[in-house]
């Protein structure tokens, strides 16, 4: 008799793929544009990235550091009207893109939470949650919660409101903290909270340290659903050298949890390459005309247009990974097992029941080397085969689809491999 199939876990929409943050509408759209109507015109692009949710804003009225002139129920007219927002919601729904609204109150000011008037602000947030849930948003994000006194109890209350409306609604909290204990204390009191933090930004870009951070986090959080990013808002290029961007994309898309990206991460958008642009929100490079300030500063291969035409680009890799992440059971909700490998390497298996299994091998170092996969670290349920098919490499040159002998597997500097192999009874 065939073995019984393992029961599928309940999957919420945010379990099925990546979230895409657009914190600054104007920077995202560029050319002096930057409103909700313009964003609606970019939804096809988001669809092409196969992201499941758009984390938008903040877009509410906020006069810097003035609590009285901060209205979480009103859209700043610079971004458009409530009608524009409703229209965006409808269009997004048609494309199966969920909309999460950032309600961080004092986003233009010094302290995101008006630290002297916490109770006033908390009431405003409560009212806003109810208002925007009725308006049809799929969830909320609040950032900088390390600046919010009694954050855990407020988050629990806001979570109750959100989940009370529908189990299908999501609350995301963001913190600048990278301290695991602080992160765990925030998570402890909030069962379904998705938390973005700077935890992984301390990885020091080495395989051993990244492995240790990931496994510590997963062990500490147990069965709860995680999110993976390098910060609550900033671009990957703020933390990583260009040669590690592909590696991190592969890792974020294949770890168990929801990958969260900022606009531009998919093309390696880098504020440092655009003189005069703010580090936290540089202009999105749709094409070479997106940054006219310095002629010639932007080459085609830095842009969405240029990378869309190049199958070997970072954008093409992002799209492929996003697609795999959203359709393969082992990547959607599979078990995770990390195991030892050569120096500078981080390798792990994702597997679910009798479905196709995935092996990820990441070389964080700038030295090519034999993978040295230590299969003895793995439980019997996740053993390695002699060969696995190469689904993709983060670097050009390998023949995709070809079987690779795992015992003789060698990685290039900064190369990541995604390999697949069938379940074997």
């Amino acid at each position: 008799r065939a073995p019984r199939c393992r029961e599928l876990p309940a999957q919420k929409w945010w379990h099925t793929g990546a979230l895409y943050r657009i914190g600054d509408l104007q920077a995202f759209q560029g050319h002096g544009a930057g409103n909700l109507a313009g964003l609606k015109g970019r939804l096809d692009y988001l669809s092409s990235l196969k992201v499941k949710g758009l984390v938008l804003g903040p877009i509410h009225k906020n006069q810097k550091d003035d609590v009285a002139q901060t209205d979480l129920l009103q859209i700043d007219p610079n971004f458009g009207s409530k009608e524009d927002f409703d229209s965006l919601l409808q269009s997004a729904k048609k494309k199966s893109i969920r909309v999460i609204l950032d309600l961080t109150p004092n986003y233009r000011g010094e302290n995101s939470w008006f630290s002297t008037q916490v109770d006033t602000v908390a009431t405003k947030v409560k009212d806003a949650l109810e208002f925007w849930l009725q308006a049809g948003v799929d969830g909320f994000q609040v950032r900088d919660i390390e600046n919010l006194k009694d954050a855990s109890s407020f988050l629990a209350e806001w979570q109750n409101i959100t989940k009370g409306f529908s189990e299908d609604r999501l609350l995301i909290a963001g913190t600048n903290s990278s301290d695991l204990q602080q992160i765990l204390s925030l998570l402890e009191s909030n069962k379904d909270l998705l938390l973005t933090s700077s935890y992984l930004s301390d990885s020091g870009s080495t395989g051993e340290h990244t492995k240790s951070l990931v496994t510590q986090y997963l062990n500490a959080t147990g069965n709860r659903w995680c999110s993976w990013s390098l910060s609550q808002a900033r671009l990957l290029t703020s933390f990583l050298p260009a040669q590690l961007l592909r590696l991190y994309q592969l890792m974020l898309f294949t770890l168990p949890g929801t990958p969260v990206f900022s606009y531009g991460d998919e093309i390696g958008l880098d504020a440092a390459a655009l003189p005069g642009q703010p580090m936290e929100a540089p202009v999105m490079l749709w094409d070479e005309s997106s940054f006219p300030d310095i002629p010639g500063a932007v080459s085609a291969n830095m842009t969405v247009k240029g990378q869309s035409e190049d199958p070997g680009s970072l954008l093409s890799l992002f799209r492929r990974l996003s697609d795999q992440r959203s359709k393969e059971r082992s990547l959607l909700h599979g078990d995770f097992h990390a195991f030892s490998a050569g120096p500078g390497l981080f390798s792990y298996i994702r597997h679910w029941d009798q479905n196709e299994r995935f092996l990820v091998v990441l070389n964080f170092g700038d030295v090519g080397l034999s993978a040295g996969l230590q299969a003895s670290d793995l439980p019997a349920s996740a053993s390695l085969p002699a060969k696995a098919d190469l689904l993709l490499s983060t670097q050009p040159g390998r023949e995709e689809g070809s079987p690779l002998e795992l015992e003789r597997l060698k990685l290039e500097p900064h190369e990541g491999l995604l390999l697949r192999f069938p379940y074997a009874a």
Epitope: G342, P343, G368, G372, G397, E412, P413
Partner: antibody, heavy 120, light 111 residues
Framework: EVQLVESGGGLVQPGGSLRLSCVAS????????MHWVRQAPGKGLVWVSR????????RYADSVKGRFTISRDNAKNTLYLQMNSLRAEDTAVYYC?????????????WGQGALVTVSS | QSVLTQPPSVSGAPGQRVAISCTGN?????????VHWYQQLPGTAPQLLIY???DRPSGVPDRFSGSKSGTSASLAITGLQAEDEAAYYC???????????FGGGTKLTVL
């Protein structure tokens, strides 16, 4: 056929400068990391420097740090080694070397070498 | 003083087997970095002989083999021939020096 041809060697006084060039052919130069390795007369091989395929990652041996500069021009299929503040102990044959792909960073092709003599 | 230690010389008669050792430490061979071997015939540039501890590039006879264990590696040559007379170098990467390191070289004499 992979070929690496060094030039620019010669006799130079201590404290002087020299620039070595290496023209590559027979492979896609812009896809490979490259190295310089030297060998003093009658002695063993010593690694000098390494540069990645687009020139953004560079490493040097401690003995040449601050004095030697590796660079490349992918449009010209050429690797360079600018050597300043030369010392007698820099006297050696300098090899231009390609780093193999999928070989664990082995050095799979070597030029014939350029002799640099530092003497007064 | 080389980071990787090789015997200065070895010798053997034609047809015999010889082995050349290469000893490192926990920041190079012992750390898991690959060992490669090069042959340098008199008056010529070195040539890659073994890569990734035990793999042979095409064109290298199967008389040459490599192995690695712990902090050491070894090159074995069977069926020794006169044309094998050369200097042999092992090479690896060293994480504490953050650079490529070579053994001092071993001169093989075919008697």
């Amino acid at each position: 056929e992979v070929q690496l041809v060094e030039s620019g060697g010669g006799l130079v006084q201590p404290g002087g400068s020299l620039r070595l060039s290496c023209v590559a052919s027979g492979f896609t130069f812009s896809s490979y990391w490259m190295h310089w390795v030297r060998q003093a007369p009658g002695k063993g091989l010593v690694w000098v420097s390494r540069i990645n395929s687009d020139g953004s990652i560079i490493r040097y041996a401690d003995s040449v740090k601050g004095r030697f500069t590796i660079s490349r021009d992918n449009a010209k299929n050429t690797l360079y080694l600018q050597m300043n503040s030369l010392r007698a102990e820099d006297t050696a044959v300098y090899y231009c070397v390609r780093e193999g792909r999928y070989t664990g960073s082995s050095l799979d092709y070597w030029g014939q070498g350029a002799l640099v003599t530092v003497s007064s | 003083q080389s980071v990787l230690t090789q015997p200065p010389s070895v010798s053997g008669a034609p047809g015999q087997r010889v082995a050349i050792s290469c000893t490192g430490n926990n920041s190079n061979i012992g750390a898991g970095y690959d060992v490669h071997w090069y042959q340098q015939l008199p008056g010529t540039a070195p040539q890659l002989l073994i890569y990734g501890n035990s793999d042979r590039p095409s064109g290298v006879p199967d008389r040459f083999s490599g192995s690695k264990s712990g902090t050491s590696a070894s090159l074995a040559i069977t069926g020794l021939q006169a044309e094998d007379e050369a200097a042999y170098y092992c090479q690896s990467y060293d994480s504490s020096l953050t650079g490529w390191v070579f053994g001092g070289g071993t001169k093989l004499t075919v008697l």
